[in-house]
Interface confidence: low
């Protein structure tokens, strides 16, 4: 008699390892013999699909080599035209030993940045990922964490984080190890010991000492007044990632010496700098104590400031007075690059006339200092803000003896033009009609930055800057 199909052995969940065989059995009783079809995730499995074997009139479905993508719900449906079709379903769970699909790679990282070492895994059950540093399991802390993905994240990388790492993926079926990778921590160049400033006598030897560290170990170069050091001997030693450089100098002129430590991180460089000044003891003595001679100014820096064919006092306490005084003024002018366009021309005039003082020829050539009033005009009218900042920084110790190089005169110690009109020199291009000062380019507003004192009038009609100066 015809009999509707009945599935006598319902499908069960099947566990299978990758590359192994997995079989589902769907035993059916019916008459006539049923047609049995199979689906995976509701998609019909074709009879001619070579990855499967269907036997026993369709009652056995065998997956010949399981892949991780084979997991899902498998159903068999039996139908013989008598009664309705019947169906039974079961799951295939693909079990897989751990596999590291994205292993970690060697990393170079700068100290303080974040490092991520990847370790992406596959496996069923899902593998747990741990990390080994050197020969020991890595402990997580507030900086070091193993992410959900298995990657290792290290915040604020420290020198001690450098070393050899590998990740370990583990589940109930086995364990997989990545290859060992190297985390290298690089450190920006840093100066540990800065060179010290010295005030020495002419012709003495001085050793400047500069120590720096970094990973890789930095190189140290020395700069003298903005140029590569042209004389002097340099001795270097490296120990425990610290480089020690000593520059020995024979002092014939003052200078600003800069130690520059540089190391390379990929294509980029990191640099640390420290500077020291060498001044000569006689440098700051009052000029009247110094022997010297009168000569026409032949330099370049003060050409636009000093009167044409001006006789200037050259101080023979320096081996080469012209070069020494020119260097001093050159160094000072470099400092003036940062001041306002109002201050700069006036400050330049002041500096040039202070360092290359007007000279009174005679049996004993005598330098003529700047008149106190002219000095005060520059200080209080032209350069009020700059002078305040400079004095404030000096008080707070932000400037070391570099400030001596600026050779800014102390106005209060200069002679007044009221004492003896011939005893002090007037600055060219400045005069004191205070009404016209208001047309002078201001620093921040349309008013002068300070109250203008009652200064003596001069024969000139306006307070101006010579056309020699560029105000741009």
């Amino acid at each position: 008699l015809p009999k509707a199909p009945v599935i006598t052995t319902p499908l069960e969940t099947v566990d299978a390892l990758v590359e192994e065989v997995a079989t589902f059995m769907c035993a059916v009783e019916s008459y006539p013999q049923p047609e049995i079809s199979w689906t995976r995730n509701k998609i019909l499995i074709k009879l001619f699909d070579t990855r499967y074997s269907i036997r026993e009139n369709g009652q056995l479905l065998t997956i010949l080599s399981v892949e991780d993508s084979d997991d899902g719900i498998y159903c068999c449906t039996a139908n013989n035209g008598v009664g309705g079709a019947v169906e039974s379903c079961g799951a295939l769970q693909v079990k897989m030993k751990p596999k590291i699909t994205r292993p970690p790679i060697n990393v170079k990282i700068i100290e303080g940045l974040k490092a991520v070492l990847p370790c992406t895994t596959m496996g069923n059950p899902k593998p747990s990922v741990s990390w080994i540093k050197g020969d020991s399991p890595l402990r997580e802390n507030s900086r070091i964490a193993v992410l959900e993905s298995g990657s290792l994240r290290i915040h604020n990388v420290q020198k001690e984080d450098a070393g050899q790492y590998r990740c370990v993926a583990k589940n109930s079926l086995g364990t997989a190890y990545s290859k060992v990778v190297k985390l290298e921590v690089e450190v920006f160049a840093r100066i540990l010991r800065a060179p010290e400033s010295h005030n020495v006598t002419f012709g003495s030897f001085v050793t400047l000492h500069c120590t720096a560290t970094g990973i890789p170990v930095p190189t140290i170069t020395w700069i003298e007044n903005g140029n590569a050091v042209s004389s002097g001997s340099i001795q270097e030693s490296v120990k425990d990632r610290v480089i020690d450089s000593r520059l020995q100098l024979f002092i014939t002129k003052p200078g600003l010496y800069t130690c520059i430590a540089t190391n390379k991180h990929g294509e980029k460089f990191s640099t640390a700098k420290a500077a020291a000044t060498i001044s000569i003891a006689e440098w700051s003595k009052p000029q009247k104590d110094n022997k010297g001679y009168c000569a026409q100014y032949r330099g370049e820096v003060c050409n636009a400031v000093l009167a044409k064919d001006a006789l200037v006092f050259l101080n023979t306490s320096y081996a080469d007075p012209e070069e020494a005084q020119e260097l001093l003024v050159h160094t000072a002018w470099n400092e003036l690059k940062v001041v306002s366009p109002v201050c700069r021309p006036a400050a330049e005039a002041l500096l040039c006339n202070h360092i290359f003082q007007e000279c009174s020829p005679g049996v004993v050539p005598t330098p003529i200092p700047i008149c106190r009033e002219y000095c005060l005009a520059v200080k209080e009218l032209f350069c009020a803000k700059e002078w305040l900042v400079m004095e404030e920084k000096t008080h707070r110790g932000l400037y070391r003896s570099e400030m001596h190089l600026l050779s800014v005169p102390e106005c209060s110690k200069l002679p007044s033009m009221h004492w003896d009109p011939t005893a002090c020199a007037r600055l060219p291009h400045l005069d004191y009609n205070k009404e016209n000062l208001k047309t002078f380019p201001p620093m921040t507003s349309s008013k002068p930055s300070v109250d203008i004192p009652n200064l003596p009038s001069s024969s000139s009609s306006s307070f101006s800057v010579s056309p020699t100066y560029s105000m741009t």
Epitope: G226, N227, A228, E267, K268, F269, E300
Partner: antibody, heavy 124, light 107 residues
Framework: EVQLVESGGGLVQPGGSLRLSCAAS????????IHWVRQAPGKGLEWVAS????????SYADSVKGRFTISADTSKNTAYLQMNSLRAEDTAVYYC?????????????????WGQGTLVTVSS | DIQMTQSPSSLSASVGDRVTITCRAS??????VAWYQQKPGKAPKLLIY???SLYSGVPSRFSGSRSGTDFTLTISSLQPEDFATYYC?????????FGQGTKVEIK
Amino acid sequence: EVQLVESGGGLVQPGGSLRLSCAASGFTVSSSSIHWVRQAPGKGLEWVASISSSYGSTSYADSVKGRFTISADTSKNTAYLQMNSLRAEDTAVYYCARSEGDRYVSGYSGFDYWGQGTLVTVSS
Amino acid sequence: DIQMTQSPSSLSASVGDRVTITCRASQSVSSAVAWYQQKPGKAPKLLIYSASSLYSGVPSRFSGSRSGTDFTLTISSLQPEDFATYYCQQSGVWLITFGQGTKVEIK
């Protein structure tokens, strides 16, 4: 290996525009200074413009100021020279060159690598 | 602008000769002076930087020196491959000027 490759040269009419590119490889534009230098046929070298992209600073020769603009795209590791209002006297081979470090250091290090040059002809 | 006056504009010399090329700055400059060699149809090549430092890979017969505002390139013993045009270059803070060039030819 450090390499600079210029492109974008060609024939242009007076008053026209052209954009030159300088593709860098073997180093990063952001950590160096890039310069454009030109050489008119049979003449000497003339500096045109410089850029230090990490500091965002640029500088130009007086002869091109206001007409040429130098720029850099660090993501493409490429520098550019946009040339507007071109004149017959701008006809030259244009080289890009690099120097180590920022604008203050670069003068001391010299232009250590140069491209092969690209010819710009301004003619009606 | 600082001018770099290069002399001579051309010279003829024989292999083995000592050759000196001078650049004079129109005003005081730093030691940010470089020397380049250029052959026809080629890009310039750096020889000397910072006035006297020899660039890597450049033969030691090339040297640079400074005396005040005068900068000198010396080739101690001229070789066949040295026949080329030589340029000096000064760099302020990116106010850069080249000398007009010196062509070194075979005598």
